[in-house]
Interface confidence: medium
């Protein structure tokens, strides 16, 4: 039997002010997923219990949308959202599987350039 592993979208990028979908998938049908945690560094963003539903951490309620499926959507991105995100799958009987996604939030690409004219 093939060992279970987490497949993620890897490195993703998005524009400031836009949104990003964080996606992880457990490539196994032989282990029971009971809960998926989404973390940013050491901060818990959201928990998806397979039967008891989604729990979004209060600090992120305005900017985190559950789904699609076990994925997580981040809204109103700022450059401060750049960094590592982790999905942690709690499974039985295997235990914990962890996946990593790196999100790069690019600053607005519209820059104002002033051109100076020299009056003779």
């Amino acid at each position: 039997t093939m060992a279970s592993m987490i497949v993620t979208t890897g490195n993703i990028s998005a524009e400031e002010g836009g949104s990003a979908i964080l996606q992880c998938h457990l490539s196994s049908t032989t282990t029971e997923v009971t809960q998926v945690n989404w973390e940013q560094q050491d901060r818990l963003l959201a928990v998806r219990h397979v039967d008891l539903g989604w729990h979004i951490s209060p600090a992120f309620k305005e900017r985190v949308v559950p789904g699609p499926s076990l994925s997580l959507t981040l809204l109103a991105l700022t450059v401060n959202d750049t960094g590592e995100y982790f999905c942690t799958y709690h499974t039985y009987p295997d235990g914990i599987y962890k996946g990593r996604i790196f999100l790069e939030v690019r600053g607005s690409s519209v820059a104002e350039h002033s051109i100076g004219f020299q009056i003779p």
Partner: antibody
Framework: QVQLQESGPGLVKPSETLSLTCTVS????????MSWIRQPPGKGLEWIGI?????NTYYANWAKGRVTISKSSNQVSLKLSSVTAADTAVYYC????????????WGQGTLVTVSS | DIQMTQSPSSLSASVGDRVTITCQAS??????LAWYQQKPGKAPKLLIY???TLASGVPSRFSGSGSGTDFTLTISSLQPEDFATYYC????????????FGQGTKVEIK
């Protein structure tokens, strides 16, 4: 105000099924998690299981296969089969238990003795 | 499975003492931890939830701290009514768990 009250027989014979009911008032079970906990005499708290607002249940590893938690409009029921003397305990129901604001409140508890 | 380990299992203290009880989770439970006080013959009473939030009506001498795997309950100045048994409880996982509670810490009069 929010209140929970456990009820059921205080004496159960070995190998029989223990059946308890938790009657709630002051809140809705349709939007609450409910937990069952027990405490053998002179020992610590033992989690039995939880029922979600949607009716899904999760049981402690030691209780799987022996325990059933269910609910109706204002009652949560606990059934524990094939009891032995080791199941003698005070049984509590409590609101909450999974990613909530703690288990609060608790019922006053009911002592169940398993003896022939 | 997550195991919750409390220490010490018992302690003796005097009125006015500062008392600290620790609880360690076998894996990360973030801030999903509650503390309870239980007196003989009574149901447990919620003291702290989400690791550090004081439950309604609980005196401010009680405080909770920690996140991840290590948590602390502190009683800043022990009062006569505080002699009791204290339990921690993880609220992070309910699937495939043996017990969500720590084994308890009994606070006795010195």
């Amino acid at each position: 105000q929010v209140q929970l009250q456990e009820s059921g027989p205080g004496l159960v014979k070995p190998s029989e099924t223990l059946s308890l009911t938790c009657t709630v008032s002051g809140f809705s079970l349709s939007s609450s998690y409910m937990s069952w906990i027990r405490q053998p005499p002179g020992k610590g708290l033992e989690w039995i299981g939880i029922i979600g607002s949607n009716g899904n249940t999760y049981y402690a590893n030691w209780a799987k296969g022996r325990v059933t938690i269910s609910k109706s409009s204002n009652q949560v029921s606990l059934k524990l089969s094939s009891v032995t003397a080791a199941d003698t305990a005070v049984y509590y129901c409590a609101r909450g238990g999974y990613r909530t604001s703690g288990m609060d409140p608790w019922g006053q508890g009911t002592l169940v003795t398993v003896s022939s | 499975d997550i195991q919750m380990t409390q220490s010490p299992s018992s302690l003796s203290a005097s009125v006015g003492d500062r008392v600290t009880i620790t609880c360690q989770a076998s894996q990360n439970i973030y801030s999903d931890l509650a503390w309870y006080q239980q007196k003989p013959g009574k149901a447990p009473k919620l003291l702290i939830y989400r690791a550090s939030t004081l439950a309604s009506g609980v005196p401010s001498r009680f405080s909770g701290s920690g996140s991840g795997t290590d948590f602390t309950l502190t009683i800043s100045s022990l009062q006569p009514e505080d002699f009791a048994t204290y339990y921690c409880q993880q609220e992070h996982l309910v699937a495939w768990i043996y017990n969500v509670f720590g084994q308890g810490t009994k606070v006795e009069i010195k």
